[in-house]
C-alpha cells in the first residue's frame, strides 16, 4: 500500500493514526469519526486543548492515545460524547492537572499520565486515590508531581469534598404550606452547588434562591405527594462531589381501602392505608376487636421507597365458616381517622342445610399424634360420611 500523505491515516478497520509532526491543532472533522473505535495521536505540539466539541461524533471510541504532544488542558466534559472510552493514554504532554470530572462516568480500564509535569494539589486527590486503590494501571506509573515529588506522598488531610448541611423545618408541615429549606455548604475550593428536584414533579411549586455558600429552596403550596420524595442538595469542589438528601414530612389524615378477600397460600384481605404520620391500625370482626394470632395476622408488603401508602393483607390461615363475616380496618393518626369494611366468606357453613335432606355426619377427633397443629382429616367407614374438623 502507498504511504498515506494525510495528517491522519486509517489504521485497521476502525482506527486512525495522526503522527505527522505538527499537523493538528484540534480534533475537529476527523475523517470517518463516527465509526472510530481507536484514535492514536502523536507529535502534535499544536494540540494544546481537548474540549467537549473536539470529540463530538466519536461515540464509538474505545481507545484514545494522545502522546508526545502539547496537550495542556483537558476540559472536565471533554469525554461526554465518548461514553465507551476504556483506554486513555495522555502520556508525555504538558498536563499540570486533570479534573475528576473528566473521568467521571467513564469505565476506564487504563489511564496513562506519565511524563506530564503534573502539579500536586487537592485537585489530584482523585488520582492519588486511584493510585492507592490500584485503579486504571496508575500505580505502575509511579506518577511524579513536578517540582514536588511522588503523587503518593501528597498530603491529603485537607483534601475533602464539600460538607453539606440541609436545614428542614422542625414544625409539622401541612398540605398547602410553604416550606423553606436551606443548604449550607462548607469546604475549600467550592465550584458549584445546586438542588436536585427530579422526584418532586407536581408535589410543590419550587423557587430557588441564594448561592454559595448558602442555598435556599422554597417549596410552595405543598401536597401530600411530597412525602418520601428526596430533595437533594449537591456541591462540587476540585476534589469531588457531595450530595445530601432530605425528605419533608407533610402531615395529612389517615385513609384506608379494603379489597375483596383472595385465596393465595393463605387467604388475604388486601388493604391500603395512607397518612402522615403513619397511622396505627386496628381490625374489627363483626364489630368486635380482632385479636391477631399466628392464624390471623396483619402482613405488610415491602413499602415503595417514594410513597407513604402501605399495602398489605390480613392473612387468614385456612379460615373456615366461623371466619366468615364483616371485617373492618380502622386507621388513625393525629390528623384524622378512617375505616373501611368488607364482607368475607371463606367457606359455606356445613350446618346450614335442609333438615329434610338427611346427610350423615361424623365428627372426627383431632389426631393427638399430629405435630403440625393443623386439623387432620380422618377417613370414616361410612361411604357418604363428611368429616369436619372445627377450627
Amino acid at each position: 500500500a502507498a504511504p498515506c500523505p494525510d495528517a491522519c491515516c486509517p489504521h485497521g478497520s476502525s482506527g486512525l493514526r495522526c503522527t505527522r509532526d505538527g499537523a493538528l491543532d484540534s480534533l475537529h472533522h476527523l475523517p470517518g469519526a463516527e465509526n472510530l473505535t481507536e484514535l492514536y495521536i502523536e507529535n502534535q505540539q499544536h494540540l494544546q486543548h481537548l474540549e467537549l466539541r473536539d470529540l463530538r461524533g466519536l461515540g464509538e471510541l474505545r481507545n484514545l492515545t494522545i502522546v508526545k504532544s502539547g496537550l495542556r488542558f483537558v476540559a472536565p466534559d471533554a469525554f461526554h460524547f465518548t461514553p465507551r472510552l476504556s483506554r486513555l493514554n495522555l502520556s508525555f504532554n504538558a498536563l499540570e492537572s486533570l479534573s475528576w470530572k473528566t473521568v467521571q462516568g467513564l469505565s476506564l480500564q487504563e489511564l496513562v499520565l506519565s511524563g506530564n509535569p503534573l502539579h500536586c494539589s487537592c485537585a489530584l486527590r482523585w488520582l492519588q486515590r486511584w493510585e492507592e486503590e490500584g485503579l486504571g494501571g496508575v500505580p505502575e506509573q509511579k506518577l511524579q508531581c513536578h517540582g514536588q515529588g511522588p503523587l503518593a506522598h501528597m498530603p491529603n488531610a485537607s483534601c475533602g469534598v464539600p460538607t453539606l448541611k440541609v436545614q428542614v423545618p422542625n414544625a409539622s408541615v401541612d398540605v398547602g404550606d410553604d416550606v423553606l429549606l436551606r443548604c449550607q455548604v462548607e469546604g475549600r475550593g467550592l465550584e458549584q452547588a445546586g438542588w436536585i428536584l427530579t422526584e418532586l414533579e407536581q408535589s410543590a411549586t419550587v423557587m430557588k434562591s441564594g448561592g454559595l455558600p448558602s442555598l435556599g429552596l422554597t417549596l410552595a403550596n405543598v401536597t401530600s405527594d411530597l412525602n418520601r420524595k428526596n430533595v437533594t442538595c449537591w456541591a462540587e469542589n476540585d476534589v469531588g462531589r457531595a450530595e445530601v438528601s432530605v425528605q419533608v414530612n407533610v402531615s395529612f389524615p389517615a385513609s384506608v381501602q379494603l379489597h375483596t378477600a383472595v385465596e393465595m397460600h393463605h387467604w388475604c384481605i388486601p388493604f391500603s392505608v395512607d397518612g402522615q404520620p403513619a397511622p396505627s391500625l386496628r381490625w374489627l370482626f363483626n364489630g368486635s376487636v380482632l385479636n391477631e394470632t399466628s392464624f390471623i395476622f396483619t402482613e405488610f408488603l415491602e413499602p415503595a421507597a417514594n410513597e407513604t401508602v402501605r399495602h398489605g393483607c390480613l392473612r387468614l390461615n385456612q379460615p373456615t365458616h366461623v371466619n366468615n363475616g364483616n371485617y373492618t380496618l380502622l386507621a388513625a393518626n393525629p390528623f384524622g381517622q378512617a375505616s373501611a369494611s368488607i364482607m368475607a366468606a371463606f367457606m359455606d357453613n356445613p350446618f346450614e342445610f335442609n333438615p329434610e335432606d338427611p346427610i350423615p355426619v361424623s365428627f372426627s377427633p383431632v389426631d393427638t399424634n399430629s405435630t403440625s397443629g393443623d386439623p387432620v382429616e380422618k377417613k370414616d367407614e361410612t361411604p357418604f360420611g363428611v368429616s369436619v374438623a372445627v377450627g
Partner: antibody, heavy 119, light 106 residues
Framework: QVQLVQSGAEVKKPGASVKVSCKAS????????MHWVRQAPGQGLEWIGT????????SLAQKFQGRVTLTRDTSTSTAYMELSSLRSEDTAVYYC????????????WGQGTTVTVSS | DIQMTQSPSSLSASVGDRVTITCRAS?????LYWFQQKPGKAPKPLIY???SLGSGVPSRFSGSGSGTDYTLTISSLQPEDFATYYC?????????FGGGTKVEIK
C-alpha cells in the same frame, strides 16, 4: 545532616551572565527536586524555577524563561542556576532550597549567594 | 498566578504578647506554608501544609485556615521571634510568597 552550600558573592556588569552553584550533602541528591528562589534588597521572596537532579527535568517561572538555565552535576551532587542578560533589577540574594516530599515543604535552604549587577 | 496578601505588613509587640498574622490567597488553595527570616539569613520553615510544625519549631507557633484565609499565631512572643514572616502557596504554578510581615520590638 542535610546541607546545601552555595558559591560566594558575585559582582557583574549589565548584560553579563552569572552561574551560582549549590552543593548538596547528607541525602540522595537525585531523589529530591531542587528549587531556586531570589530576594531583592528589602523585598520579598520570588520563585525562579526547579530542577529534578534524577533526570534534569526543569520548570521555570514564566518571567525567567529564556534567561535562566538550571543544570546539575550528579557526580558532585551540585545544582547550578545560570542567569544571563543581567540587569540592575537582578541584584538580589539567590537561594537554593530542597523540596522534601516526605513532609511536602522546602525544608533545607542554602545560605544564599549575593549577586550584584552594577555598571 | 495566585497572589498572596499578608497583613499587617509590620507590627510592634512586646515579649509575651500573642501575635496573629494573616495571609489571604487570591483564590482557594490546598495548603499553606509559613517561613521565618532574620536579617542576612535564609528563610527557615515554620509551618508546612497549613498546620504542621517544622522540625525544631517551638509549639508556641501554630497555623490554621482553609480555602483563601490562613493565620499564623505566636501564642507568647519570645525575643528570638522578632523577624519577618512569609506565607507561601503552592496550589498551582508558580509557587508564590506573601509580601512579608515584619514583627518588631515595641
Amino acid at each position: 545532616q542535610v546541607q546545601l552550600v552555595q558559591s560566594g558573592a558575585e559582582v557583574k556588569k549589565p548584560g553579563a551572565s552569572v552561574k551560582v552553584s549549590c552543593k548538596a550533602s547528607g541525602y540522595t541528591f537525585t531523589t529530591y527536586w531542587m528549587h531556586w528562589v531570589r530576594q531583592a534588597p528589602g523585598q520579598g521572596l520570588e520563585w525562579i524555577g526547579t530542577i529534578y537532579p534524577g533526570n534534569s527535568d526543569t520548570s521555570l517561572a514564566q518571567k525567567f524563561q529564556g534567561r535562566v538555565t538550571l543544570t546539575r552535576d550528579t557526580s558532585t551532587s551540585t545544582a547550578y542556576m545560570e542567569l544571563s542578560s543581567l540587569r540592575s533589577e537582578d541584584t538580589a540574594v539567590y537561594y537554593c532550597t530542597r523540596f522534601y516530599f516526605e513532609d511536602w515543604y522546602f525544608d533545607v535552604w542554602g545560605q544564599g549567594t549575593t549577586v550584584t549587577v552594577s555598571s | 498566578d495566585i497572589q498572596m496578601t499578608q497583613s499587617p505588613s509590620s507590627l510592634s509587640a512586646s515579649v509575651g504578647d500573642r501575635v496573629t498574622i494573616t495571609c489571604r490567597a487570591s483564590s482557594s488553595i490546598s495548603w499553606l506554608y509559613w517561613f521565618q527570616q532574620k536579617p542576612g539569613k535564609a528563610p527557615k520553615p515554620l509551618i508546612y501544609y497549613t498546620s504542621s510544625l517544622g522540625s525544631g519549631v517551638p509549639s508556641r507557633f501554630s497555623g490554621s485556615g482553609s480555602g483563601t484565609d490562613y493565620t499564623l499565631t505566636i501564642s507568647s512572643l519570645q525575643p528570638e521571634d522578632f523577624a519577618t514572616y512569609y506565607c507561601q502557596q503552592w496550589h498551582s504554578y508558580p509557587p508564590t510568597f506573601g509580601g512579608g510581615t515584619k514583627v518588631e520590638i515595641k
